[in-house]
């Protein structure tokens, strides 16, 4: 792959924030935005937020979706607004699971 050596400083993006880590805020600022879905005690837990540290996002976003967790990442202001992470189940739902948005 061609090594272009970008000289620009990392840009900060505004991201939608939903979940316990957001406190009372509905947005956050970071180098990447994310939307995640995980299964916790039988619930589908949806979260959105930002990675302040680019490398943290880079590593987290590398992780392939599993039956218990999926993360989708993007760069751009509010880019995670219309992203909903999906588990790799090809349309099948897990027995005994419910949708649950962490607000």
């Amino acid at each position: 792959m061609e090594d272009e050596k970008p000289k620009v400083n990392p840009k900060l993006y505004m991201c939608v924030c939903e979940g316990l880590s957001c406190g009372n805020e509905d947005h956050c600022e970071g180098q990447q935005c994310f939307s995640s879905l995980s299964i916790n005690d039988g619930f589908h837990v949806y979260q959105k937020g930002c990675f302040q540290v680019y490398e943290q996002g880079k590593m987290t976003c590398k992780t392939p979706p599993s039956p218990g967790q999926a993360v989708e990442c993007c760069q751009g202001d509010w880019c995670n607004r219309n992203i909903t992470a999906q588990l790799p189940t090809k349309g099948k739902s897990f027995p005994g699971t419910q949708n649950f948005h962490l607000e």
């Epitope: 792959m1 050596k5 990392p10 540290v53 680019y54 490398e55 880079k58 590593m59 590398k62």
Partner: antibody, heavy 119, light 107 residues
């Protein structure tokens, strides 16, 4: 067991280039960011940059932007550091290191490669 | 670039004593700080990550504290193998930068 095996010491002429290697075992480099760090004799540590071997993305410290090129070959599980237009200031030990999502820091380090620039 | 100012540059101490090093960041870095130990002729070894968390296998006499711009690293009850150089590193914003190091010598 995770290991990073670096290539042997290099003695190079001023103005020349050198390529150092870092071969990983015990993990797939595609699952990590591979970093390089410089340490001059009796001095501190300087971060050079990283590569994501999965997609080839790189980040460099400004001081090394025109000096260093980091590459990786996933089939051989190896990361490389190429240093160009060498001067005595480039004489140092160069370490590769693995950045993991367990600690979000450089958890494992190679043993280092000594580069001596001399005519 | 974020500057990391580490102090002291060197310190002498005796076996069994406690020592504390400080690292100051030129801007806030949250808890994105690591501490490494390096012995002569060896590569650095991770001791502390996320400013306060102990890496696996690291003895509990090592500890880290702080957030934002001021961080501390403590070794309680010094052992012979602890005499080495120690470096802090910020991992918040590239270029990641190290402190200048602290060389801990036996008194």
């Amino acid at each position: 067991e995770v290991q990073l095996q670096q290539s042997g010491a290099e003695l190079v002429r001023p103005g020349a280039s050198v390529r150092l290697s870092c071969t990983a075992s015990g993990f797939n480099i595609k699952d990590s960011l591979m970093h390089w760090v410089k340490q001059r004799p009796e001095q501190g540590l300087e971060w050079i940059g990283w590569i994501d071997p999965e997609d080839g993305e790189t980040r460099y410290a400004p001081n090394f932007q025109d000096k260093a090129t980091i590459t990786a070959v996933t089939s051989s599980n190896t990361a490389y550091l190429q240093l160009s237009s060498l001067t005595s200031e480039d004489s140092a030990i160069y370490y590769c290191a693995r950045y993991t999502s367990r600690y979000y820091t450089m958890e494992y380090w190679g043993q280092g490669t000594s580069v001596t620039v001399s005519s | 670039d974020i500057q990391m100012t580490q102090s002291p540059a060197s310190q002498s101490a005796s076996l069994g004593e406690s020592v504390t090093f400080t690292c100051l960041a030129s801007q806030t870095i949250g808890t994105w700080l690591a501490w490494y130990q390096q012995k002569p002729g060896k590569s650095p070894q991770l001791l502390i990550y996320a400013a306060t968390s102990l890496a696996d296998g690291v003895p509990s006499r090592f500890s880290g504290s702080g957030s934002g711009t001021k961080f501390s690293f403590k070794i309680s009850s010094l052992q012979a193998e602890d005499f080495a150089s120690y470096y802090c590193q910020q991992l918040y914003w590239t270029p990641w930068t190290f402190g200048g190091g602290t060389k801990l010598e036996i008194k």
